[in-house]
Amino acid sequence: LVPHLGDREKRDSVCPQGKYIHPQNNSICCTKCHKGTYLYNDCPGPGQDTDCRECESGSFTASENHLRHCLSCSKCRKEMGQVEISSCTVDRDTVCGCRKNQYRHYWSENLFQCFNCSLCLNGTVHLSCQEKQNTVCTCHAGFFLRENECVSCSNCKKSLECTKLCLPQIENVKGTEDSGTT
């Protein structure tokens, strides 16, 4: 099966790498613009220079291109707890990330929120916190894992999953209650 090519890919594939086909004259291959620049004017003829201009502040192109405009720099989303790791330059977009001891939770492919890594209080660290994954905790006896926090078995209701982990404690509580009736 031949992969479906868009019009722009079809046009580009006629020319050697690093060049693109002139939009008004398909017998001319123009040199693409370097990263950090954009296409101001197509080359007037074969072997003649493409008119490329540097991106203005607040915009960038990260690869060779024949874009008519540079791309707008991304802004880190403060409401998602994001911080700027490196600022935007003409040839590289802003890099956003999380603070130390935080991890990313992705709401979609391009949107993440920063959350604090779990400290595993009343438990031990099974897997350390990573860029895109919270700490994995193992709880001490008498505690069960709820939303990645170790919670006392005294907070375990019979209907919850914790009953298996907290069974001895629940039986003890039940026994204590029964012994009080004598």
Partner: nanobody
């Protein structure tokens, strides 16, 4: 076919409370992150709140933080939004939405919306 049906909207006085529900069908509800989005009259869409598939992660817009609570019941395929201390500026159509798994769009599917009017 994915269906998201919101309910619970209505007229409420400032300071009052409402609980919105979203009944989901046509997909495996507990595999998807979900959210609430709103559109005030004559304004653009505003993210209100998101919740991950198992309820461990939540997001709230600054404008609703401390007043609204998102939750879900995966056994009932239902998403909720508890809205307390309502203000006039919360007046909007509230949409339940399924968050995208991949691609540049944040949402894949939306409900028809339910109108919340906060007025004395």
């Amino acid at each position: 076919e994915v269906q998201l049906l919101e309910s619970g909207g209505g007229l409420v006085q400032p300071g009052g409370s409402l609980r919105l529900s979203c009944a989901a069908s046509g997909f495996t509800f507990d595999k998807y992150q979900m959210g609430w989005v709103r559109q005030a009259p004559g304004k653009g869409l505003e993210w209100v709140s998101f919740i991950d598939s198992n309820g461990h992660h939540t997001y709230y817009a600054d404008s609703v933080k401390g007043r609204f609570t998102i939750s879900r019941d995966n056994s009932k395929n239902t998403l909720y939004l508890q809205m307390n201390s309502l203000r006039a500026e919360d007046t909007a159509v509230y949409y339940c939405a399924q968050l995208s798994v991949q691609g540049s769009n944040l949402f894949d599917y939306w409900g028809q919306g339910t109108l919340v009017t906060v007025s004395s």
